[in-house]
Every structure is written in structure tokens, then in C-alpha cells.
């Protein structure tokens, strides 16, 4: 019967006793940077080409006995998970292996850098179809390794890496922390984070998604027909590399940004038990388990968005945090979050010709996060309209006044430290959906976009009694682009998007009274693109 991990990544419509995905990734080449491999294993023979690249450190210890089957173990298993005949994800994908890890599974930053350069040169000399590079390794944070990954990604290569097996913040490791790389954490058959001895999968904002990574059956280098189960974020990353190969084989023109958005979109949502993660990391860690799309074609009509969290600002009074979208993505909204509730809001601002989301810490605050909503919106023309703090008691308001521009997000930023704690709620005038409303002491920023066929609407959900969390979701066919709290709601820690749901968090209700000050309203802006929908119907 089908191994649990292959069943897990298969959409229900393809589920059967056999794993038979619609396309095997035959147009894609996957580069594996790992240990040596046993290329004559019948699971991968003829599918994996061993390059002559080798850059590894000496093994530790004078008594180390170099045994071929042990040296090949990690790489052989991963090659099998990506493209193995029986237990592989992308059964049609061809692979090339580069040896950057020694027989003890250790490598160097320089060896990996030279390996990435080898791939870049190979690509220049003999351009082929789409390339996926699998980096099932993790070391301490390295600016130079992250920069090399960025260069390769900007040359059109998809890089997939392991989050690391240190039960720690993936942002502390490389290449997991490189924003251009697709970073993968590991889950088990119960969709729980993988525990490995006293450690386990890494987590946090640098993880893009999770994938099966415990008790994964794959080729064993013990013998040419041997199989073995292995666990870890390397195995999880191999699943995503296989899924990416299949997606790219079906749609070879996909950009890295489009691929990442699709991986996120088609993942299983909210199935991971977040209690396993440290409390401060739960909100930052994506609750996503990778899966194949239900159809490898026809996803082009959707408006894809993802949430990008910044690093923590730190606690100093004037500290800020910045969240950025990928080069091919549009920043459609910006929000902020502080565990202490002490923040001075957020705003969208231009940086290097591109909009970024900046959040501001407040005096006495423990720090803030900026949260960007990053979307794929072809031919978009977006701008930020700002209204400075108003004197009128009705508060500050700003709208999208340009013809054909729609509101995709609202942000507010203020200089005073205690904004909103003793102010009555400000009500949004009805029938004015293209408008952002805020406190009179705050400057309000509206993200206004023009794109063919783009339409948006505002959805609100208010709870009169105090509540730790208020949510509002966009309905089927609409995508959440903006998430904010209605002004006047006190004790708000911040707002952020989780998939298609806007979440507004408040302080622990036990510390607040049940007056109207405790009222919380979540405001979602939901958009869709009729242009994209029509384009896809024409293609079919």
C-alpha cells in the first residue's frame, strides 16, 4: 500500500492504493547537494547522474572507518524520496548529485558555495528546463551562503532547503534563513512537528511550510534493493523539491514567487498542533503541510497572497521592524503585532523602489513585528495614500481617489504612546468601502491598486464583549489582502493574516473590563481578479 507520506501529499481526488500523480516532473532537473550516493540502487538507477563535483572536509577522528554504504546513506535516501521509482514524489524527475557532505554528514560553507557556483556555471554553459536545487543541510547563520542562494534564485533557480533539526528558530541557520529559498520543516503521520531525540524540526518565520519528515521510506545504500526509513527536515525538503519539480513540469514558466505562492496555497492548512512550538514562535510559524495541487494546470486564475513576518524589532523605544515581499510580489497591505500591546502602528513606505512594511515599537514595549501581505498581481500599479493625523473628532480617513484604483489594505501609525486606550470607537461611515478610517492622532495609510479586473470588498466582524482573538475570513473565490483592527478598539496587540483569515489579537480579557472599550472589530479586505479568471478560462 502507499506509504503514509506519499498519501499525505496527494490530493483526495488522486488518492488510491497506488501513488500515481498526474505528472512526474519529467521536464525538470533536480540538483542534490549532499553526501555521495549509491547511483546503482534500482530505485534511482538511471535517474540520478553523479557529477564529478566533490568538496568535503576530512572526517573527524583518527578511528573513523569509511564505509561506502554509510557514506552514501543520506544522499541515496533523499534522491529516492525526490524521484525514486517506488517511494519517490516526482517519479519522472532527473537528478544530478554534488558531494558537499562527508561520510559523517558534515560539510563547509565554502564547499556549498562552490557547489552552488558549479550549478550556476552548468546552467550558463548548457541551459536546460526548470532547475530545482535541493539543499538538505543546515549550519549556523551565514550571510555569504544566503547571498549565494539569493544570486542563484534571481537567476531563475528554485532552491529548497531543510529548516534544520535543532528544535530552534530556523532564522538562526543557513541556508534556511535566506528569504529566496523555500525552507521546509518536518511533520509526522499525525501532522505534528517531528521530534528527533531531544531536538526536532526547526520552526519560525523563516519556515515557508512543513512536509512529511518522519519515518519516510526510501532507498537504502545498504544494498541495491534495500529500503529504510529516515527522519528529518532533509526528508521534508526532498518532498517539497519533488512537488516543485512536478509543478514546474506542468507549468515550466512559473517564477519562484509563483511557485512559492502555489506551494503555500495548496498546502493543508491548520493541521499542525502549534503547542509543540515555543509560545513566542507559534504566531510566526506557518501552519501548512505541503501537498500536490489537485490539478497541475488551471491555478493561474487565482489571486495568490502570503503573509511575511519581519524579524523582531527589539525593545528600544524607536525600534522598527521591516517586512519585505519578494521582487515579483506586490505589497498589498501592512499590519503590526506586539505581544505587550505597546506599539505605534505601521506604515508602508518606499525603499529601493519597492514598498516595504515598517512597524514601530512604543516606549515600554518589548518590540514589534511588521506583517506584510504579499501577493501575485500581474500588471498591478499600486500606491500608498496617506492622511496625516486629523483634528476632527471623527478621526482620520483616507480613500483611493484615483480612477480604477481599489483599496487593498489599511495601515495606521501614530506618535503618541497610549493611542486608543481611552477613546470611544470611531465608526466607519457606511457605503464607503474604499476608505481607511483611524484615530485622529494617527496617520492613516491606504494601499490603493489598479490591476486588470481587480475588485475588492471590506468585511468586518465585531465582538462587543472583550475577546482575546477576533477573526474574519474571506469567502471562497476571494483572497485576503488586508487585515486590520477598527480604530477605537482598545488593548489590541495587532492584526495579521493567517491564510484567508484576518486575526485581530487583544490583551488577555481578564485584564480588561467588559465595557465598550473591550469591543474588538476585525476588518478584512477581500479581493479577486476577474481578469485572471477570464484568462485561465481562455487557456483551457
Amino acid at each position: 500500500s502507499i506509504p503514509w507520506n506519499l498519501e499525505r501529499i496527494t490530493p483526495p481526488r488522486y488518492r488510491a492504493d497506488e501513488y500515481q500523480p498526474p505528472d512526474g516532473g519529467s521536464l525538470v532537473e533536480v540538483y542534490l547537494l549532499d553526501t555521495s550516493i549509491q547511483s546503482d540502487h534500482r530505485e534511482i538507477e538511471g535517474r540520478v547522474m553523479v557529477t564529478d563535483f566533490e568538496n568535503v572536509p576530512e572526517e573527524d577522528g583518527t578511528r573513523f572507518h569509511r564505509q561506502a554504504s554509510k557514506c552514501d546513506s543520506h544522499g541515496t535516501h533523499l534522491a529516492g524520496v525526490v524521484s525514486g521509482r517506488d517511494a519517490g514524489v516526482a517519479k519522472g524527475a532527473s537528478m544530478r548529485s554534488l558531494r558537499v557532505l562527508n561520510c559523517q554528514g558534515k560539510g563547509t560553507v565554502s564547499g556549498t558555495l562552490i557547489g552552488l557556483e558549479f550549478i550556476r556555471k552548468s546552467q550558463l554553459v548548457q541551459p536546460v528546463g526548470p532547475l530545482v536545487v535541493l539543499l538538505p543541510l543546515a549550519g549556523g547563520y551565514s550571510r555569504v551562503l544566503n547571498a549565494a542562494c539569493q544570486r542563484l534564485a534571481r537567476a531563475g533557480v528554485v532552491l529548497v532547503t531543510a529548516a534544520g533539526n535543532f528544535r530552534d528558530d530556523a532564522c538562526l541557520y543557513s541556508p534556511a534563513s535566506a528569504p529566496e529559498v523555500i525552507t521546509v520543516g518536518a511533520t509526522n503521520a499525525q501532522d505534528q512537528p517531528v521530534t528527533l531525540g531531544t531536538l526536532g524540526t526547526n520552526f519560525g518565520r523563516c519556515v515557508d511550510l512543513f512536509a512529511p519528515g518522519e519515518d519516510i521510506i526510501g532507498a537504502s545504500s545498504d544494498c541495491s534493493t534495500c529500503f529504510v526509513s529516515q527522519s528529518g527536515t532533509s526528508q521534508a525538503a526532498a518532498h517539497v523539491a519533488g512537488i516543485a519539480a512536478m509543478m514546474l513540469s506542468a507549468e515550466p514558466e512559473l517564477t519562484l514567487a509563483e511557485l512559492r505562492q502555489r506551494l503555500i496555497h495548496f498546502s493543508a492548512k491548520d493541521v499542525i498542533n502549534e503547542a509543540w512550538f515555543p509560545e513566542d514562535q507559534r504566531v510566526l510559524t506557518p501552519n501548512l503541510v505541503a501537498a500536490l495541487p489537485p490539478s497541475t494546470h488551471g491555478a493561474g486564475w487565482q489571486l495568490f497572497c502570503r503573509t511575511v513576518w519581519s524579524a523582531h524589532s527589539g525593545p528600544t523605544r524607536m525600534a522598527t521592524a521591516v517586512a519585505r515581499c519578494a521582487p515579483d510580489e506586490e505589497l498589498l497591505s501592512c499590519s503590526s503585532f506586539s505581544r505587550s500591546g505597546k506599539r505605534r502602528g505601521e506604515r508602508m513606505e518606499a525603499q529601493g523602489g519597492k514598498l516595504v512594511c515598517r512597524a514601530h515599537n512604543a516606549f515600554g514595549g518589548e518590540g514589534v513585528y511588521a506583517i506584510a501581505r504579499c501577493c501575485l498581481l500581474p500588471q498591478a500599479n499600486c500606491s500608498v495614500h496617506t492622511a496625516p493625523p486629523a483634528e476632527a473628532s471623527m478621526g482620520t480617513r483616507v480613500h483611493c481617489h484615483q480612477q480604477g484604483h481599489v483599496l487593498t489594505g489599511c495601515s495606521s501609525h501614530w506618535e503618541v504612546e497610549d493611542l486608543g486606550t481611552h477613546k470611544p470607537p470611531v465608526l466607519r461611515p457606511r457605503g464607503q468601502p474604499n476608505q481607511c478610517v483611524g484615530h485622529r492622532e494617527a496617520s492613516i495609510h491606504a494601499s490603493c491598486c489598479h490591476a486588470p479586473g481587480l475588485e475588492c470588498k471590506v468585511k468586518e466582524h465585531g465582538i462587543p464583549a472583550p475577546q482575546e482573538q477576533v477573526t474574519v475570513a474571506c469567502e471562497e473565490g476571494w483572497t485576503l489582502t488586508g487585515c486590520s483592527a477598527l480604530p477605537g478598539t482598545s488593548h489590541v496587540l495587532g492584526a495579521y493574516a493567517v491564510d484567508n483569515t484576518c486575526v485581530v489579537r487583544s490583551r488577555d480579557v481578564s485584564t480588561t473590563g467588559s465595557t465598550s472599550e473591550g469591543a474588538v472589530t476585525a476588518v478584512a479586505i477581500c479581493c479577486r481578479s476577474r481578469h485572471l479568471a477570464q484568462a485561465s478560462q481562455e487557456l483551457q
Partner: antibody
Framework: QVKLVQSGAEVKKPGESLKISCKGS????????IAWVRQMPGKGLEWMGI????????HYNPKFQGQVTISADKSISTAYLQWSSLKASDTAMYYC????????????WGQGTLVTVSS | DIVMTQSPDSLAVSLGERATINCRSS????????????LAWYQQKPGQPPKLLIY???TRESGVPDRFSGSGSGTDFTLTISSLQAEDVAVYYC?????????FGQGTKVEIK
């Protein structure tokens, strides 16, 4: 149910060519290997080679490499064993058998095809 | 190639009695990574194809009577028929499936005494 059905007995002359077949049914043909096994009269079993119909990967026993060709047509769930020039010593019963990647033993066998080569 | 050697070549046992067949491989077929012995036993009755009885040295194939059992590890293996029945008259083969070429033992013929 799962089964492998082989083509009928063949009587051939030395030097002639021959292609015998093995048709799978009741399971996903492309997801399992097909092995070919020879049994000469009154003798034991000899593994000749395998094919993975999903991508036509083959692996031969060196003893049979160059003597026979193993192929498959996944569209009709059929594997083949062929000779370009038969010899009298090729007289034997030939079995096809199914095996799975991580269970690489033969759980289902065809009924066998008897090939007789005689002048 | 891994050479498989069976003993005895033939065996005559009374109905209801125990039959024991041995198989030795020229190198170990036990692999530490998954702790499995890559060895199977087949039964072949006259005029029929072989039938899988035991795999992983000791796991009985579904539908196989429990009088058939396999044991052993590394290089030495045993197939035991605890109480021989008339329908058990056949040739029994061991097979290693760990490395190419896959190889069989020469066979052991079991008859009724």
C-alpha cells in the same frame, strides 16, 4: 484479482526470433517491477532480469545480458522477453513475476511459457 | 554474485512429521539500517509456477498455512514445515533479493516417506 497472464507455448527452430509476453491486471502495472525467471527442464530457477514499466528501466543478470531483451508497453500493461536468434539451450519454461520496490520479492507469478527450440 | 546453497537436495518425511530445509548465503543478507534479512522461500509444485511462502526470512505470506515458518539471520536460514501434509510435496527454493543478480538456491525436493 491480481494476476499475470503469459502467452502460450512456442516451438521454434534455432536462429529464429521470438517475443513472449506477460500481461498484468488487477493492479497498477507501472508501479511494480516485472522479473523474468528461467527454468530449464528438470532444473532450478534462474533470475534473468527485471523491468520497471513506469520508465522502462531494466537490469539484467550478466549471464543473460546481450542474449535477451526485456521490454514493456505500459499502455497495454504488458512486459516482453525476446530473443533475436534462439539456440537449443534456450529451451526452458519462462516465468514472469511481479515485485515491488521496497518488497523486492516475487509475490505474483505468471503461469509460465514453455519455449522449445529444436531443429 | 551471492551464491545460495540449500541442504539437503531432497528430503523424505512421514505425514505429520517435521520437515526442515536449510539455506546458506555466501554473504550476509541482513542489513543493519532496517534490520531485515533479504531472503524469501518459494514452493513449486509439479507443473505450476513458484509460490511465495516466506519473505524477510520469517514473515509468512498471507494465505500460507501456519505450519510453514522461516527462521535464521545473516547467512544461515531454515524453512520448517511443522507437520507435513500430502499437499506439501514440492520443490522448495530460497532466494536472496538484496543484490543483483537476484539468486536462488538449487532447490530441495520434499517427498512423503
Amino acid at each position: 484479482q491480481v494476476k499475470l497472464v503469459q502467452s502460450g507455448a512456442e516451438v521454434k527452430k534455432p536462429g529464429e526470433s521470438l517475443k513472449i509476453s506477460c500481461k498484468g491486471s488487477g493492479y497498477s502495472f507501472t508501479n511494480y517491477y516485472i522479473a523474468w525467471v528461467r527454468q530449464m527442464p528438470g532444473k532450478g530457477l534462474e533470475w534473468m532480469g527485471i523491468i520497471y514499466p513506469g520508465d522502462s528501466y531494466t537490469h539484467y543478470n550478466p549471464k543473460f545480458q546481450g542474449q535477451v531483451t526485456i521490454s514493456a508497453d505500459k499502455s497495454i500493461s504488458t512486459a516482453y522477453l525476446q530473443w533475436s536468434s534462439l539456440k537449443a539451450s534456450d529451451t526452458a519454461m519462462y516465468y514472469c513475476a511481479r515485485d515491488h520496490g521496497y518488497k523486492p520479492f516475487s509475490d505474483i507469478w505468471g503461469q509460465g511459457t514453455l519455449v522449445t527450440v529444436s531443429s | 554474485d551471492i551464491v545460495m546453497t540449500q541442504s539437503p537436495d531432497s528430503l523424505a518425511v512421514s505425514l505429520g512429521e517435521r520437515a526442515t530445509i536449510n539455506c546458506r548465503s555466501s554473504q550476509s543478507v541482513l542489513y543493519s539500517s532496517n534490520n531485515k534479512n533479504y531472503l524469501a522461500w518459494y514452493q513449486q509444485k509439479p507443473g505450476q509456477p513458484p509460490k511465495l511462502l516466506i519473505y524477510w526470512a520469517s514473515t509468512r505470506e498471507s494465505g500460507v498455512p501456519d505450519r510453514f515458518s522461516g527462521s535464521g539471520s545473516g547467512t544461515d536460514f531454515t524453512l520448517t514445515i511443522s507437520s507435513l501434509q500430502a499437499e506439501d510435496v514440492a520443490v522448495y527454493y530460497c532466494q536472496q533479493y538484496s543484490s543483483f543478480p537476484i539468486t536462488f538456491g538449487q532447490g530441495t525436493k520434499v517427498e512423503i516417506k
